[in-house]
């Protein structure tokens, strides 16, 4: 089979998930992604990005945070915050635009 | 393997809001290999990409219906949705909810029709 | 927003034939992401090349696909009966993800 598309040099990040594989992944970039779901804990997830890039440039919300950056383990000792809860008419929006 | 299918409404009225349903079955949402995505076929037309969701529940739309479209996901029924507001004719369509990643839209569901008349 | 334009709007050509469909991009495709379609009526679409040249999962080694940059190759060498269909490309590297307009393939 033809070989995977050129998607530039790789970054080896830390993995930190459910869907971990291993310690660490490789990807274009590296992630880390805050998510607190309705009546939950947050939950920081770490790995690598390959693909829609404009995620990382989103506004943090009270519900998720996405963070990226391009260097070796890079998203190892990154912790990130939730914004607080805001009234309705305040609330950014987790739109990627 | 994982599969998708389509649940909503065949008829909204104009003005009214249009909702669908995306239940993936045979693999998890909250995978971060893979982005949910909303596409619509106009009868007769090609292939329209409304928007996108991450199990964060990031989004990504289409900016000619951003001001329209809402996509949200729930993880724990394994479920992504959508919501088109003040529909009009020419939002009939056939909507299709498909999993994208690195390798492209590899799953598709099999696509609802939606009609919008009073 | 990258505008992707298929050439030609329809193709007619006999079984056994060699097919050649054409998507060009007004911009370049970002990291190689292009793919491509087959939709025949009443049916989904069916992912056949992801990355401008990796076939998907059970697709037949008849279609193939290749280009770079803004312009790109469906290639299907030996045209099947089951074959004739609807063709779209899609760039998926940056949002918005855009489709092109599609290739008929009818048989001539």
């Known amino acids: 089979d033809p070989v995977k598309p050129s998607r530039g040099p790789l970054v080896t990040c830390t993995c930190e998930s459910p869907h971990c594989k291993g310690p660490t992944c490789r990807g274009a970039w590296c992630t880390v992604v805050l998510v607190r779901e309705e009546g939950r804990h947050p939950q920081e997830h770490r790995g690598c990005g390959n693909l829609h890039r404009e995620l990382c440039r989103g506004r943090p919300t009270e519900f998720v945070n996405h963070y990226c950056c391009d260097s070796h383990l890079c998203n190892h000792n990154v912790s990130l915050v939730l914004e607080a809860t805001q009234p309705p008419s305040e609330q950014p929006g987790t739109d990627g635009q | 393997q994982v599969q998708l299918q389509e649940s909503g409404p065949g008829l909204v009225k104009p003005s009214q809001t249009l909702s669908l349903t995306c239940t993936v079955s045979g693999g998890s949402i909250s995978s971060g290999d893979y982005y949910w995505n909303w596409i619509r076929q106009h009868p007769g037309k090609g292939l329209e990409w409304i928007g996108y969701?991450?199990?964060?529940?990031?989004?990504y739309y289409n900016p000619s219906l951003k001001s329209r479209v809402t996509i949200s996901v729930d993880t724990s029924k394994n479920q992504f949705s959508l919501k088109l507001s003040s529909v009009t004719a020419a939002d009939t369509a056939v909507y299709y909810c498909a999993r994208e990643s690195t390798d492209g839209m590899d799953v598709w569901g099999q696509g609802t029709t939606v009609t919008v008349s009073s | 927003e990258s505008v992707l334009t298929q050439s030609p709007g329809t193709l007619s050509l006999s079984p056994g034939e060699r097919a050649t469909l054409s998507c060009r991009a007004s911009?370049?495709?970002?990291?190689?992401?292009l793919a491509w379609y087959q939709q025949k009526p009443g049916q989904a679409p069916r992912l056949l090349i992801y990355?401008?040249?990796s076939r998907a999962t059970g697709i037949p080694d008849r279609f193939s696909g290749s280009g770079s940059g803004t312009d790109f190759t469906l290639t299907i060498s030996r045209l099947e009966p089951e074959d004739f269909a609807v063709y779209y490309c899609q760039q998926y590297g940056s949002s918005p993800i855009t489709f092109g307009q599609g290739t008929r393939l009818e048989i001539k």
């Open positions: 990355g401008v040249s």
């Open positions: 969701i991450y199990y964060s529940g990031s989004t």
């Open positions: 911009q370049s495709v970002s990291s190689s992401y």
